[in-house]
Amino acid sequence: MRRERGRQGDSSSCERQVDRVNLKPCEQHIMQRIMGEQEQYDSYDIRSTRSSDQQQRCCDELNEMENTQRCMCEALQQIMENQCDRLQDRQMVQQFKRELMNLPQQCNFRAPQRCDLDVSGGRC
């Protein structure tokens, strides 16, 4: 069930790179950190799972991209966009954004200095 590959344009662009990686472990990792003992997330039970599972795979995926501020920011923006509708209130949105901005540091990457995580047309 692999996504469609090879968007038109420069194959080394951030868009192409973000499209190739699996950001779901990053999304789960952050959701687990902010939801803790919540019942269910996506159909995957996160009640008793170690966040390190998702974090290792998440960092591996982010590491696949060129380590530029712009590409890292695009990946974080994509994660935010993917999860926006699942975040139930403003407080949860802020928590998610805070954890998201900490993600590069957790993976020992440089955090993007300016990265707008506001999702256009959404609550986020």
Epitope: S43, Q54, N63, E64
Partner: antibody, heavy 123, light 108 residues
């Protein structure tokens, strides 16, 4: 047709070296993480090593760490396993396996396997 | 290292019966990273279930996976003659990506 074909197995003395190769065809090799998995005679499966698409992240089983080196050549659609300081316990069928993930939910899995190449370490 | 223990080691059943195979992890594993494979003698393993419960393409619906945390189960609702094989669970979330020792499903 999506296919993985391993080669390079054979008989080698303890302490010797071998280089296994895996030729991939029928898919965009550079879009997939790759793994080596082995199976000793009459035993179960043992994961050996994995390498990500760009080779930036590599993992090894403790049993082979420091002796085996995984590598890939995306231009040639090939995966390799350099095996040094071989031991009797390394005798096994070595499988090359492609790792994919479910785009909608995220899980990873090895969905394409080669038929394996046999490595025998014996004096 | 996460150790996966499968039970029973051997399961003897007849075609038409229900098979329940267990996989227990030494530490909690996210459902996202739990996979089941089938292997027949002289063949490479074949992907059955990923994400603990999602059937791979082409796998009959008599195969189902369930569980969470440290306890996972593969169920075959009505055994067909071609289902007799060895089944392995694997976790692929945390390196090293360990396999269970396998459960051999044999004809009674």
């Amino acid at each position: 047709e999506v296919q993985l074909v391993e080669s390079g197995g054979g008989l080698v003395k303890p302490g010797g070296s071998l280089r296994l190769s895996c030729a991939a065809s029928g898919f965009i090799f550079s879009d997939y993480n790759m793994n080596w998995v082995r199976q000793a005679p009459g035993k179960g499966l043992e994961w050996v090593s994995s390498i990500t698409r760009s080779s930036r992240t590599i993992y090894y089983a403790d049993s082979v760490k420091g002796r085996f080196t995984i590598s890939r050549d995306n231009a040639k659609n090939s995966l390799h396993l350099q095996m040094n300081s071989l031991r009797d316990a390394d005798t096994a069928v070595y499988y090359c396996a492609r790792e994919d993930f479910d785009v909608s939910t995220g899980p990873y899995y090895m969905d394409v396997w080669g038929n394996g190449t046999t490595v025998i370490v014996s004096s | 290292e996460i150790v996966l223990t499968q039970s029973p080691g051997t399961l003897s059943l007849s075609p038409g019966e229900r098979a329940t195979l267990s996989c227990r992890a030494s530490q909690s594993v996210s459902n996202m990273f739990l996979v089941w494979y089938q292997q027949k003698p002289g063949q490479a393993p074949r992907l059955l279930i990923y994400g603990a419960s999602t059937r791979a393409t082409g796998i009959p619906d008599r195969f189902s996976g369930s569980g969470s945390g440290t306890d996972f189960t593969l169920t075959i609702s009505r055994l067909e003659p071609e289902d007799f094989a060895v089944y392995y669970c694997q976790q692929n979330g945390n390196s090293p990506y360990t396999f269970g020792q396998g459960t051999k499903l044999e004809i009674k």
